[in-house]
Amino acid sequence: MAVTACQGLGFVVSLIGIAGIIAATCMDQWSTQDLYNNPVTAVFNYQGLWRSCVRESSGFTECRGYFTLLGLPAMLQAVRALMIVGIVLGAIGLLVSIFALKCIRIGSMEDSAKANMTLTSGIMFIVSGLCAIAGVSVFANMLVTNFWMSTANMYTGMGGMVQTVQTRYTFGAALFVGWVAGGLTLIGGVMMCIACRGLAPEETNYKAVSYHASGHSVAYKPGGFKASTGFGSNTKNKKIYDGGARTEDEVQSYPSKHDYV
């Protein structure tokens, strides 16, 4: 029961996390205009991974896409790549984890197979979460660097009457969404990996005892057989499930509402 709960919770947490990573990647507010020096701006600038936007006092918002690949900073390209890799891995992980869920039965899939799938999806979620966290962190670092550089050059042409104020950018909402979402995906992945340990059948060595009618000696054969790990083979073998021994037949003879054949 605890394993199912851990697996289910891991799946849900990862699902929320990946949805958050997708949302963060699509959001326009990765960086927003710093209003510290000019809190009464009539023009508010913000930028995303794919386009930059300007919102005027009226609410009129104008967004312009980055219609170039070669002209973009390498760091921005790297962030895009990390986020996309995170989404792709997360999506594959979700697909795998759906089939790995203990509450869903697909044909005669054994728990060992589900354990492997759970582990695979868990690792995918962990890597996905790390990609998102890395991507957001790289962008944040880029912002911090640019912020202090533009602060140093805040006013150009101070010698004359004319001032050119450089727009400074600070952390946007998407960064926080990305960090939280990446963290959730990572946590979900860890939970899936933990659930995998509980799902995997114990490598129990049953000792075969041979009794001889005439002799007094008892022969012990170590390692009689291992619990079945194949698909559909040795279905009559006894396995340990959460402390209770049941046969595969017993497990399959009571289909629940969650079973899909």
Epitope: T41, A42, V54, F60, T164
Partner: antibody
Framework: EVQLLESGGGLVQPGGSLRLSCAAS????????MHWVRQAPGKGLEWVAY????????YSTDTVKGRFTISRDNSKNTLYLQMNSLRAEDTAVYYC????????????WGQGTLVTVSS | DIVMTQSPDSLAVSLGERATINCKSS????????????LTWYQQKPGQPPKLLIY???TRESGVPDRFSGSGSGTDFTLTISSLQAEDVAVYYC?????????FGGGTKLEIK
């Protein structure tokens, strides 16, 4: 047709108060930010205050801060300017203007109401 | 606050001739985010409220005759009337629309020579 009609102007003594109103019609009032702009007799235009469409944001020029308050009642399609501690230099024609959807401009203006501050 | 300086204070131009009004801001009005200049031009005829002519430094408001055009970027802007008509006699104001408080230029009085 967009119409803005100011009212509430008149003669007031220094230190006195006055409340200007601007009745809007011909457009969805709650969709637009609104401005007050004044013009002293024979002088140029001076922007006074702005209120966003949702009433959440207000800005005003330093010379009137703490004395003038801009507000709006979207249910009545009316813009207000509460003027306290009036000074002689506040004497002007006060215009209400609609904030344009583009370029932070002011696309429609009322005919104005004259406020005279004199003892 | 941004200071707007208009020149000349007054201008006399013959009918059909070109009229040019200049406006200079103390701070750049060019927004890097959309590469637009937040400068507006208004026309005020005697006894009337101002009328919007041009926003974003060069975009004509609907209904404004095409003889009116705006140009410039950053801190230097120009309003041009390509062929002056009698009805163009007015005071013209430039206005910063980049940050609050909005500020107007002193105005340029345009008359017929």
């Amino acid at each position: 047709e967009v119409q803005l009609l100011e009212s509430g102007g008149g003669l007031v003594q220094p230190g006195g108060s006055l409340r200007l109103s601007c009745a809007a019609s011909g457009f969805t009032f709650s969709d637009y930010g609104m401005h007050w702009v004044r013009q002293a007799p024979g002088k140029g235009l001076e922007w006074v205050a702005y209120i966003s469409r949702g009433r959440s944001t207000t800005y005003s020029t330093d010379t009137v801060k703490g004395r003038f308050t801009i507000s709006r009642d979207n249910s009545k399609n009316t813009l207000y300017l509460q003027m306290n501690s009036l000074r002689a230099e506040d004497t002007a024609v006060y215009y209400c203007a609609r904030g344009s959807y583009y370029g932070n401009a002011m696309d429609y203006w009322g005919q104005g109401t004259l406020v005279t501050v004199s003892s | 606050d941004i200071v707007m300086t208009q020149s000349p204070d007054s201008l006399a131009v013959s009918l059909g001739e070109r009229a040019t009004i200049n406006c200079k801001s103390s701070q750049s009005l060019l927004n890097s985010g959309n590469q637009r200049n937040y400068l507006t031009w208004y026309q005020q005829k005697p006894g009337q409220p101002p009328k919007l002519l041009i926003y974003w430094a060069s975009t004509r408001e609907s209904g404004v005759p095409d003889r009116f055009s705006g140009s410039g970027s950053g801190t230097d802007f120009t309003l041009t009337i390509s062929s002056l008509q009698a009805e163009d006699v007015a005071v013209y104001y430039c206005q910063s629309a980049y940050s609050y408080p909005f500020t107007f230029g002193g105005g340029t009085k345009l008359e017929i020579k």
